[in-house]
Interface confidence: medium
């Protein structure tokens, strides 16, 4: 087991004329993210296979708005490694493709929307463990620069992430056989359970006493490399550390194919066989079909059965796109009424209304009053989506069936006391206080704080409260 | 629904100014970058300005042959966008439109703008 | 500025047909286009945007394609309510700059 690493330096345009304009619109700003596909081996079915190595997206770069007018400059990076982990061997030979993505960040309803700017792919050896290998590939007017490794997880080591490692036994040094694993000096390989003479760099076994080989080698030991068609070509002279005869310059010499395609010779120039996606006479054109599953979220695609013929992707509800790659914010056209809140649901859009409204988009206002009586002679009032009973005196309550005790606020001060009356309250008022809640004091010279008792109630009586 | 209503079209002599408004409804008004486009027979539909949304600063573009002349600005609490239009000429007769959302997703009835002697 | 063109300024077709409308521009508008319907009584309607994303609203029959410099609106089975006049435009660059428009009728 282990982790394949892609650090991406740069996205721009690349060398010569026809510079592209910037990815974002005047209109729209946007920012880039990029996804790797990883395939095993080398082989021309490996490409149009899934990623069966692996895949990864990466986070989201920094928001780009064009300067109109203006060249496109190499656009800001999100942070970070991509990382692909695999389970098993590694393989040694793989295809990648890495695809930059642009996701505009206007106000369009919907939300964000991504789209696939630009599309490598390529074929490449690789031993895990090994330093990081530095690329740069084209597509159509823009660059990628990019940096990539296969590291193993502990307790995996080698080429392939094969060999395991445990703690050593013995604190001095490994047991017979046994060397140390480098880099980790303070462990011990351990014993090598593949078949005896199975080459550590070109073979592996997930079996005891297995050899199973690396692309590109065979042999019951690994030991022997594959022929290729170099190696079989009449041109030039042999090279004598491979026994391979040498090409001398051809039309395929230094791969005029993009993208990963292969070179074929032809009586008067060069044939280029392009991988699933890509087409043109070099292989510099991009034309995504539903072989490169360009369907987000479920989506089903239809079409697409040459390179260059357009895909439809059938969204699953709650998304929508060109690549089902939006989620379908429904709530966003506000579609409750009256200030009803707005659940999406997935399947289904659902209305939450307020009290007084109803319907599946709250858009029934309901009679507040209507076959609702106030008791007691109370009246209804509507309002806010609510009734309320506006009680008769001496009632309470929502529906004024609940006689009021207006003797429960105290309402009669300096100790007098209440009584409740059909109309109302009335206070007895303590010694030397007056008033309709005995909140005067009487004056030790008779007179009260009050200009005038009302006629009929001398200072002292109980004073009803009207 | 979304809904868009401009108003304030009408004849004017060539000189003079007009302000052209647009009631919006139906969706989140403060989102939403608003525009105005005009059509005319002469020259068909022509993109005249552009006003962003507050998390854009409400920034301001507008086509080389109004910049200096016309003035788009928004009031989010009234859910409005306002077109002033200063020294008109007989070339800035047309259908004034208004539309919403960056992809011009919305678009109103337009009211018409004369501009004649 | 960006000059989009729409060759074909009027289009006759029957009920049912397979119409297709293209537009052109002067240089690599990279996606950004949209179409419109505007009906006989002004009525403006966006169909698609980004080159290929349909609208909300609209049938599924309008769908758009192109890249680069060439884009083209489609419309798989007429009906009669798509009587109108069609247009594109660039929002690739300011200033956003529209087609001559596409007049479709019934034969």
């Known amino acids: 087991a282990g982790v394949f690493e892609l650090q991406i330096h740069s996205f721009g345009p690349g060398p010569g004329p026809g510079a592209p304009r910037s990815p974002c619109s005047a209109r729209l700003p946007c920012r880039l993210f990029f996804r790797v596909c990883l395939k095993p081996g080398l082989s021309e079915e490996a490409a149009e296979s899934p990623c069966a190595l692996g895949a990864a997206l990466s986070a989201r770069g920094p928001v780009y708005t064009e300067q109109p007018g203006a060249p496109a400059p190499d656009l800001p990076l999100p942070d970070g490694l991509l990382q692909v982990p695999f389970r098993d061997a590694w393989p040694g030979t793989f295809s990648f493709i890495i695809e930059t993505w642009r996701e505009e960040l206007g106000d369009q309803i919907g939300g964000p929307a991504w789209s696939l700017l630009a599309r490598v792919a390529g074929r490449r050896r690789l031993a895990a463990g090994g330093p990081w290998a530095r690329d740069i590939q084209r597509a159509g007017a823009w660059e990628l620069r990019f940096s990539y490794r296969a590291r193993c997880e502990p307790p995996a080591v080698g080429t392939a992430c094969t060999r395991l490692c445990r703690p050593r036994s013995a604190p001095s040094r490994c047991g017979p056989g046994l060397r140390p694993c480098a880099p980790l000096e303070d462990e011990c390989e351990a014993p090598l359970v593949c078949r005896a003479g199975c080459s550590p760099e070109h073979g592996f076994c997930e079996q005891p006493g297995e050899c199973r080989c690396l692309e590109g080698w065979t042999g019951p030991l690994c030991t022997v490399p594959v022929s290729t068609s170099s190696c079989l070509s009449p041109r030039g002279p042999s090279s004598a550390t491979t026994g391979c005869l040498v090409p001398g310059p051809g039309p395929c010499d230094g791969n005029p194919c993009a993208n990963g395609g292969s070179c074929s010779e032809t009586p008067r120039s060069f044939e280029c066989t392009c991988p699933r996606g890509f087409y043109g006479l070099r292989c510099e054109v991009s034309g995504v079909t539903c072989a490169d599953g360009p369907c987000f979220n479920g989506g089903l695609c239809v079409g697409g059965a040459d390179p260059d013929s357009a895909y439809i992707c059938h969204c699953p509800p709650g998304f929508q796109g060109s690549n089902c790659e939006k989620r379908v914010d429904r709530c966003s056209l506000q579609p409750c009424r009256n200030g009803g809140l707005c659940l999406d649901l997935g399947h289904a859009l659902r209305c939450r209304c307020r009290a007084g409204f109803a319907g599946p988009r709250c858009e029934h206002d309901l009679d507040d009053c209507a076959g609702r009586a106030c008791a007691n002679g109370g009246t209804c009032v509507e309002g806010g989506g609510a009734h309320r009973c506006s009680c008769a005196l001496g009632f309470g309550g929502r529906d004024c069936r609940e006689r009021a005790d207006p003797c429960a606020a105290r309402p009669c001060a300096h100790g007098g006391r209440c009584y409740a009356h059909f109309s109302g309250l009335v206070c007895a008022c303590a010694p030397g206080y007056m008033g309709a809640r005995c909140e005067f004091p009487v004056h030790p010279d008779g007179a009260s704080a009050l200009p005038a008792a009302p006629p009929g109630l001398r200072p002292g009586d109980p004073q009803r409260y009207l | 629904e979304v809904k868009l209503e401009e108003s304030g079209g009408g004849l004017v002599q060539p000189g003079e100014s007009m302000k052209l408004s647009c009631a919006a409804s139906?969706?989140?008004?403060?989102?939403?970058?608003m525009d105005w486009v005009r059509q005319s027979p002469e020259k068909g539909l022509e993109w005249v300005a552009e006003?962003?949304?507050?998390?854009?600063?409400?920034?301001?573009y507008y086509a080389e042959s109004v910049k200096g002349k016309f003035t788009i600005s928004r009031d989010d609490s009234k859910s409005r966008v306002y077109l002033q239009m200063n020294n008109l000429r007989a070339a800035d007769t047309g259908i004034y439109y208004c539309t919403a959302y960056s992809n011009f997703a919305y678009w109103g009835q337009g009211t018409l703008v004369t501009v004649s002697t | 500025d960006i000059q989009m063109t729409q060759t074909t300024s009027s289009l006759s077709a029957s009920l049912g047909d397979r119409v297709t409308i293209s537009c052109r521009a002067s240089q690599n508008i990279i996606n950004y286009l949209n179409w419109y319907q505007q009906k006989p009584d002004g009525t403006v309607k966006l169909l698609i945007y980004y080159t290929s994303r349909l609208h909300s609203g609209v049938p599924s029959r309008f769908s758009g394609s192109g890249s680069g410099t060439d884009y083209s609106l489609t419309i798989s089975n007429l009906e009669p309510e798509d009587i109108a006049t069609y247009y594109c435009?660039?929002?690739?660059?300011?200033?956003?700059?529209f087609g001559g428009g596409t007049k479709l009728e019934i034969k």
């Open positions: 435009q660039q929002y690739s660059e300011r200033p956003y700059t």
């Open positions: 006003i962003r949304n507050k998390a854009n600063n409400h920034a301001t």
């Open positions: 139906g969706f989140t008004f403060s989102d939403a970058w």
